[in-house]
């Protein structure tokens, strides 16, 4: 697994550097998760041809993966800090059930999958500290999540492989948009 944020060689080499600001810490945390996702995607793409498959739509129908849209206030046009922050936190909370699903999907990258899941929990905490309007953040229903997890795990092998690929791709895209939006805040 990669070295967690704040523990890379640059930080070790520069002990007198200013401590990271909250924004820098969040940025670094997202990039750490993105690096983890890249490693997981490598294993997925090497193991199957899902990354080149044109049948993604078949599996996508079963999923309700969070997506960033213009109305969420995270794009440069119509940027709205509060609305966007709520969207990012809500989206990450919704991704948690899918990250749980990924936990048993990797052989050589099991640790990496766990690191992505735990780092996302930390990221949510960082962002919740930053958010003022916590009332607007809806937490997914645990019962709904449990039944979704059961449903995903009951899929045939091909659909499970495709679901893994789609979760990783969508999570990567969501984080990249979040990264860009947070840099405007």
């Amino acid at each position: 697994a990669p070295v967690p944020p704040g523990e890379d060689s640059k930080d070790v080499a520069a002990p007198h550097r200013q401590p990271l600001t909250s924004s820098e810490r969040i940025d670094k945390q997202i990039r750490y998760i993105l690096d983890g996702i890249s490693a997981l995607r490598k294993e997925t793409c090497n193991k199957s041809n899902m990354c080149e498959s044109s049948k993604e739509a078949l599996a996508e129908n079963n999923l309700n993966l969070p997506k960033m849209a213009e109305k969420d206030g995270c794009f440069q046009s119509g940027f709205n800090e509060e609305t966007c922050l709520v969207k990012i936190i809500t989206g990450l909370l919704e991704f948690e059930v899918y990250l749980e699903y990924l936990q048993n999907r990797f052989e050589s990258s099991e640790e990496q999958a766990r690191a992505v899941q735990m780092s996302t929990k930390v990221l949510i905490q960082f962002l919740q500290k930053k958010a003022k309007n916590l009332d607007a953040i809806t937490t997914p229903d645990p019962t709904t999540n449990a039944s979704l997890l059961t449903k995903l795990q009951a899929q045939n092998q091909w659909l499970q492989d495709m679901t893994t690929h789609l979760i990783l791709r969508s999570f990567k895209e969501f984080l990249q948009s979040s990264l860009r939006a947070l840099r405007q805040m």
């Epitope: 995270c74 794009f75 440069q76 990249q176 860009r180 840099r183």
Partner: antibody, heavy 120, light 106 residues
Framework: EVQLVQSGGGLIQPGGSLRLSCAAS????????MIWVRQAPGKGLEWVSD????????YYADSVKGRFTMSRDISKNTVYLQMNSLRAEDTGVYYC?????????????WGRGTLVTVSS | DIVMTQSPSTLSASVGDRVTITCRAS??????LAWYQQKPGRAPKVLIY???TLESGVPSRFSGSGSGTDFTLTISSLQPEDFATYYC????????FGQGTKLEIK
């Protein structure tokens, strides 16, 4: 092999409109970040806009915001720069390029550039 | 926009000299900075990215350093083919460039 073939430049009067095209081959624009950069005659490079492949999210330099629109057609693997309300200071060579890497780090491929001249 | 200020705008040097170009960002950009070389009539070519990572195929006489707001590009021993214009570019948000440094023969 990655290639970016540009077209659409030319002479245009102030206040006019022009659309630049950039046809990509060797990679898919639907999973890459694209960028337009311009260079006025004898001057430096100026970032104009970029398009994050995810959700087609676009960003613009203050100098072109509200006048220029960057878009894409995934089926044609082509990106566009629609330029409206053109001014003399928009004159220059416009480069279409691709950001490298997942969190853009640098430009790894450039088009040959297309000359836009805004003059009456 | 993030403003990138590059200096000097022109630099006269001789083959074998060690030269340094600096670039300052109007806000912190972590290490999201690249250096490019451009020759007349050509598209720019990347030399360094992530502030200090040398692009493959680029001679080791080129090096970059810095983080946050202040960055430098150093050419340890100038070669005849190094006389060109150099630009820094941030990729933290958008992709603004410095105004360029023209490196000319003394």
């Amino acid at each position: 092999e990655v290639q970016l073939v540009q077209s659409g430049g030319g002479l245009i009067q102030p206040g006019g409109s022009l659309r630049l095209s950039c046809a990509a081959s060797g990679f898919t624009i639907s999973s890459n970040y694209m960028i337009w950069v311009r260079q006025a005659p004898g001057k430096g490079l100026e970032w104009v806009s970029d398009l994050y492949y995810y959700a087609g999210d676009t960003y613009y330099a203050d100098s072109v915001k509200g006048r220029f629109t960057m878009s894409r057609d995934i089926s044609k693997n082509t990106v566009y720069l629609q330029m409206n309300s053109l001014r003399a200071e928009d004159t220059g060579v416009y480069y279409c390029a691709r950001w490298a890497d997942d969190h853009p780090r640098y430009i790894d491929h450039w088009g040959r550039g297309t000359l836009v001249t805004v003059s009456s | 926009d993030i403003v990138m200020t590059q200096s000097p705008s022109t630099l006269s040097a001789s083959v074998g000299d060690r030269v340094t170009i600096t670039c300052r960002a109007s806000q912190g950009i972590s290490s999201w900075l690249a250096w490019y070389q451009q020759k007349p009539g050509r598209a720019p070519k990347v030399l360094i990215y992530k502030a200090s990572t040398l692009e493959s195929g680029v001679p080791s006489r080129f090096s970059g350093s810095g983080s946050g707001t202040d960055f430098t590009l150093t050419i340890s021993s100038l070669q005849p083919e190094d006389f060109a214009t150099y630009y820094c570019q941030q990729s933290w948000l958008g992709g603004s460039f410095g105004q360029g440094t023209k490196l000319e023969i003394k």
